[in-house]
């Protein structure tokens, strides 16, 4: 009876012992220590790490497994050769000894060994499959690791550059704030000085007012005397006229009517013989509507209708559309004549536009446009200019082609922002453009680095706010 027993030896190799009668056959098989048994589970979702150590371990383990597999394969081949050799020898002996029982036993043992060999081969195939699976998994993990590492590196780089940018911005802003603080202190000092000057002025004016009040009282008394004298004179004149009309009625039956003369512009006023600077009443074209304007009868041959004047900051130019339409301010001081009147006037005949400018250093310059007109209100009083000459820049500081007029409540500019609200005043803003003569009035020493001041870029640059400006028009054929 065959006794088949499996045990372990002292060095951990597996022993396969076959007892058959008085003969005992022992086979020593090597144990594959580095192979994971099929019963021990492989955890695929272990925490991924970027540490390169794990990767090196895996590579080493794989190399060990490959070596073991190679050894096993070689061992199997040796075992097969050994069995075949032994079988041959045994067969020869059996044949020689003619022991048939032993032959049967050997065949049985051979069969068992072959079966065991097949079992080992199957196990090795399983191990090989597991190793392949593990290798694939490890490769995927490695790929994931490298991808996430790249991503993290990119993020770190981005963040670092962002931090650097922010730091640069921060230091720039800090410098700006400090500069602004310095400016603020200087401005405060100048404001204090101005306040003191104003207080002196106010006290002076108060004393002047008192004197004037006294003079007014005297003048009022004189005025009543003069009124009486005028009344007496009028009576005398009326009596004389009555007498004259009575004596002349037979000779001339026609009665002369007082002719009401109306002027469209200052050129007409000039041509009628009024050659003195001053305020004159003008009439809208084809209408009885009237408007008061200042006429410059001296500059460049006279006959100029002043449509805008800035000189002292006494008038607020941050006005509504309707105010720019009808005009505002005082014609003898700072004022805007009115877009509607200028539009109607400049569409009747050809006009030239002269813009006269003064800076705070005593310099003067001008820009002359040989053709100027404004579109109607429906077209937002768009400005049209042609033929620039003059000393206030070779390039027009009023953007070409002309833009629509914009005010704080009528945003018709080409900017997503609202230029009029930002830069103050109504103007033919582009986006926002190189000029604005209706900006904030800044006094001397506060007139630089002002984005919302009285600007004429191609003469004084962007941040310079002018001291005085005059816009005047006159017929081209004057």
């Amino acid at each position: 009876y065959n006794n088949f027993r499996k045990s372990m030896d002292s060095i951990g190799k597996k022993q396969y012992q076959v007892q058959h009668g008085s003969c005992s056959y022992t086979f020593l098989l090597p144990e594959m220590d580095n192979c994971r048994s099929s019963s021990s589970p492989y955890v695929s979702n272990a925490v991924q790490r970027d540490a390169p150590l794990e990767y090196d371990d895996s590579v080493q383990r794989l190399q060990v497994l490959e070596n073991i597999m190679e050894n096993n394969t070689q061992w199997l081949m040796k075992l097969e050769n050994y069995i075949q050799d032994n079988m041959k020898k045994e067969m020869v002996e059996i044949q020689q000894n003619a022991v048939q029982n032993q032959t049967a036993v050997m065949i049985e043992i051979g069969t068992n060994l072959l079966n065991q060999t097949a079992e080992q081969t199957r196990k090795l195939t399983d191990v090989e499959a597991q190793v392949l699976n593990q290798t694939t998994r490890l490769e995927l993990q490695l790929l994931e690791h490298s991808l996430s590492t790249n991503k993290l590196e990119k993020q770190i780089l981005d963040q670092t550059s962002e931090i650097n940018k922010l730091q640069d911005k921060n230091s720039f802003l800090e410098k700006k704030v400090l500069a602004m603080e310095d400016k603020h202190i200087i401005q405060l000092q100048s404001i204090k000085e101005e306040k003191d000057q104003l207080q002196v002025l106010v006290s002076k004016q108060n004393s002047i007012i008192e004197e004037l009040e006294k003079k007014i009282v005297t003048a009022t008394v004189n005025n009543s005397v003069l009124q009486k004298q005028q009344h007496d004179l009028m009576e005398t004149v009326n009596n004389l006229l009555t007498m004259m009309s009575t004596s002349n009625s037979a000779k001339d039956p026609t009665v002369a009517k007082e002719e009401q003369i109306s002027f469209r512009d200052c050129a007409e006023v000039f041509k009628s013989g009024h050659t003195t600077n001053g305020i004159y009443t003008l009439t809208f074209p084809n209408s009885t509507e009237e408007i008061k304007a200042y006429c410059d009868m001296e500059a460049g041959g006279g006959g100029w209708t002043i449509i805008q004047r800035r000189e002292d900051g006494s008038v607020d130019f941050q006005r509504t559309w309707k105010e720019y339409k009808v005009g505002f301010g005082n014609p003898s001081g700072e004022y805007w004549l009115g877009n509607e009147f200028v539009s109607q006037l400049t569409n009747q005949q050809r006009y030239v536009l002269k813009i006269h400018l003064k800076d705070w250093e005593g310099n003067e310059a001008y820009s002359l446009y040989e053709h100027f007109y404004l579109s109607s209100e429906e077209l937002n009083y768009r400005i049209h200019l042609k033929g620039l000459t003059g000393t206030a820049g070779k390039i027009s500081s009023i953007s070409q082609p002309g833009n629509d007029f914009s005010t704080k409540d009528g945003d018709n500019d080409k900017c997503i922002c609202k230029c009029s609200q930002m830069l103050t005043g109504g103007w033919w803003f582009d986006a926002c453009g190189p000029s604005n003569l209706n900006g904030m009035y800044y006094p001397q020493r506060q007139n630089t680095n002002k984005f919302n001041g009285i600007k004429w870029y191609y003469w004084k640059g962007s941040g310079y706010s002018l001291k005085a400006t005059t816009m005047m028009i006159r017929p081209a054929d004057f």
Partner: antibody, heavy 119, light 108 residues
């Protein structure tokens, strides 16, 4: 379509304050001025003031300075008029009306709010 | 402020009659900023004529406006029953806006 919806009638005690509202719809609220007018029984219209919601600029009739305060909430397209230190003289019908910056005539009016000041 | 004086304060008219009411300003007004409104009893005012002579939308052609400077007028060429209302002129020539006291048109 353009609509100006005014808040309902108000009854207030003398010395108190009241806030009337005018909710605009059917147009861009910030592009038009909102004006307020007062009309006492059997009397004419009196202009109180206006607000331009686009910038928050306000203009008042001198007579109503200190009495009326105009505000506007762009998010809800609503204009408000607060009347303070109420007296019987403030009992009246109040209208809100709008105009565009070019037209300058009141093309749409609210349905009115009646304010009664009584102890 | 620019005071607007409307006359007459009250006027009576028969159906089909032509009526004219006036609005006089204490200082000159731009024709662009003189407007007329109609207010019926218990209702809100309604725009009638804007910019001196332009009819508001939905206003019948029997209404017309004219004028310039300080003198403006509103004319109804042929009065109809639905014209029974108070008519206000309104101006802007610088703040404040002002309204006239109104002309009440009654039908005989």
């Amino acid at each position: 379509q353009v609509q100006l919806q005014q808040s309902g009638a108000e009854l207030a005690r003398p010395g108190a304050s009241v806030k009337l509202s005018c909710k605009a719809s059917g147009y861009t609220f910030t592009d038009y001025y909102i004006n307020w007018a007062k009309q006492r029984t059997g009397q004419g219209l009196e202009w109180i003031g206006e607000i331009y919601p686009g910038s928050g600029d306000t203009y008042y009739n001198e007579k109503f300075k200190g009495k009326a305060t105009l505000t506007a909430d762009k998010s809800s397209s609503t204009a408000y008029m607060q009347l303070s230190s109420l007296t019987s003289e403030d009992s009246a019908v109040y209208f809100c009306a709008r105009y565009g910056y070019k037209g300058v005539y009141f093309d749409y009016w609210g349905q009115s709010t009646t304010l009664t000041v009584s102890s | 402020e620019n005071v607007l004086t409307q006359s007459p304060a009250i006027m009576a008219a028969s159906l089909g009659q032509k009526v004219t009411m006036t609005c006089s300003a204490s200082s000159s007004v731009s024709s662009s900023y003189l407007h007329w409104y109609q207010q019926k009893s218990g209702a809100s005012p309604k725009p009638l004529i804007h910019r001196t002579s332009n009819l508001a939308s939905g206003v019948p052609a029997r209404f017309s406006g004219s004028g310039s400077g300080t003198s403006y007028s509103l004319t109804i060429s042929s009065v109809e029953a639905e014209d029974d209302a108070t008519y206000y002129c309104q101006q802007w020539s610088g703040y404040p806006f002002t309204f006239g006291a109104g002309t009440k048109l009654e039908l005989k």
